[in-house]
């Protein structure tokens, strides 16, 4: 059962992390122009990965794409693809995953193979959580350097009469929903790891013999051997006795043939 | 069509209080008040956030004017305090457009500090 | 707070006439987010609430006449009137629409020669 929730809850998790990645990619707050203590502004600016936008005191909003692909900052270019890198991967893990968890029944699919399913996408959840928080955490950086820049020459030509303020930015809520969804893809990903590890007993090869203590007769489970997995530690075939003792768990994933629909 | 359409104008002793309305019909996000004094320039006093309520003034008029708005009644409001001689002008409720212009523009009201 | 000042105060000009007038910024009215200089033109005749004419430093207000036409960037901008008619006999004002407070020139009276 416990294992059974581990990947459960690891699916949601990653699926909601993934869901704010794929939002914070599309966001077009991920810098906000730095109003310093005037809260109000009669032109606020705010810039996204894929277009920029002007909101004025009138309530019109502009927006203006970057329609340029050669003219974007390199930086720019390598957030949007670990973006991109990151929701693709999240995206094939999920689908990965639906096929991993262990309440959905596929035909005649064993453990060891959702067992296999579960650790891919684990593994690519957690490389995808880690491109959206890189992603993030580069552009983060990138607008830490410009705003000291333009903090250093916040006003140009001061000797003259004539004075040019220059927009600075700050962390726009992208940033924080990408920061927050990366870690918990993370998250969903390492859950998915845990759970593939109780999906894959130490001894996954057995010749399940279930003893009844009321008779004499012994009933012999059938399936023969189940090929190894390699993820425990004996890959040795052995006779597992199990003294008619089994967790929810245990009898899960046992296959028979009223498990095929 | 938007229409704005102000009252509340008049008379008033120096030291007293004044509240100047302008009727609002057909959509506004935001709204601001400009005067102008007798044969003077425009000059801006407050714009209000229609939606929020959130305001902003010229500094000449921070802690004796208040911009506020009735939505139910969708009523802009200009509360004036501490009025001076030099308060004396034509007061005109207008809408912020694209590219913060103001597009729309009541017919003004004469507000009058005398003794 | 950003001053404005226009130029010139009061002209006479005849019907037909090509008007400038000049209006400049105290600080850079060019928004960098959209490349846009935040800056307005009105028309004023006696006893009679400011008319929008040009937004966006040289975008002309629907219903205002073609001959009506504004450029600039930064601190400097203009306000022209390619052939005046009877009707633009008035007074003309910028605005500073970029930061609050908002601010306007003092004005240009367009007189009759």
């Known amino acids: 059962m416990a294992v059974t929730a581990c990947q459960g809850l690891g699916f949601v998790v990653s699926l909601i992390g993934i869901a704010g990645i794929i939002a914070a990619t599309c966001m077009d707050q991920w810098s906000t122009q730095d109003l310093y203590n005037n809260p109000v502004t009669a032109v606020f600016n705010y810039q996204g990965l894929w277009r920029s936008c002007v909101r004025e005191s009138s309530g019109f909003t502009e927006c203006r794409g970057y329609f340029t692909l050669l003219g974007l900052p390199a930086m720019l270019q390598a957030v949007r693809a670990l973006m991109i890198v990151g929701i693709v991967l999240g995206a094939i893990g999920l689908l990965v995953s639906i096929f991993a968890l262990k309440c959905i029944r596929i035909g005649s699919m064993e453990d060891s193979a959702k067992a296999n399913m579960t650790l891919t996408s684990g593994i690519m959840f957690i490389v995808s959580g880690l491109c959206a928080i890189a992603g993030v955490s580069v552009f983060a950086n990138m607008l830490v350097t410009n705003f000291w820049m333009s903090t250093a020459n916040m006003y140009t030509g001061m000797g003259g009469m004539v004075q040019t303020v220059q927009t600075r930015y700050t962390f726009g809520a992208a940033l924080f929903v990408g920061w927050v969804a990366g870690g918990l893809t993370l998250i969903g990903g390492v859950m998915m790891c845990i759970a593939c590890r109780g999906l894959a007993p130490e001894e996954t090869n057995y010749k399940a013999v279930s003893y009844h203590a009321s008779g004499h007769s012994v009933a012999y489970k059938p399936g023969g051997f189940k090929a190894s997995t390699g993820f425990g530690s004996n890959t040795k075939n052995k006779k597992i006795y199990d003294g008619g003792a089994r967790t929810e768990d245990e009898v899960q994933s046992y296959p028979s043939k009223h498990d095929y629909v | 069509e938007v229409q704005l359409v102000e009252s509340g104008g008049g008379l008033v002793q120096p030291g007293g209080s004044l509240r100047l309305s302008c009727a609002v019909s057909?959509?506004?996000?935001?709204m601001n008040w400009v005067r102008q004094a007798p044969g003077k320039g425009l000059e801006w006093v407050a714009w209000?956030?229609?939606?929020?309520?959130?305001?902003t003034y010229a500094d000449d008029f921070k802690g004796r004017f208040t911009i506020s708005r009735d939505d139910s009644k969708n009523t802009l409001y200009l509360q004036m305090n501490s009025l001076r001689a030099e308060d004396t002008a034509v007061y005109y409720c207008a809408r912020s457009s694209m590219g913060n212009g103001f597009d729309y523009w009541g017919q003004g009201t004469l507000v009058t500090v005398s003794s | 707070d950003i001053q404005m000042t226009q130029s010139p105060s009061s002209l006479s000009a005849s019907v037909g006439d090509r008007v400038t007038i000049t209006c400049k910024s105290s600080?850079?009215?060019?928004?960098?987010?959209?490349?846009?200089?935040?800056l307005t033109w009105y028309q004023q005749k006696p006893g009679k609430a400011p008319k929008l004419l040009i937004y966006?430093?040289?975008t002309l207000e629907s219903g205002v006449p073609s001959r009506f036409s504004g450029s600039g960037s930064g601190t400097d901008y203009t306000l022209t009137i390619s052939s005046l008619q009877p009707e633009d006999f008035a007074t003309y004002y910028c605005q500073n629409a970029y930061s609050f407070p908002f601010t306007f020139g003092q004005g240009t009276k367009v007189e009759i020669k």
């Open positions: 600080q850079s009215l060019l928004n960098s987010g959209n490349q846009k200089s935040y």
């Open positions: 057909g959509y506004t996000f935001s």
């Open positions: 966006w430093a040289s």
């Open positions: 209000i956030n229609m939606y929020t309520g959130e305001p």
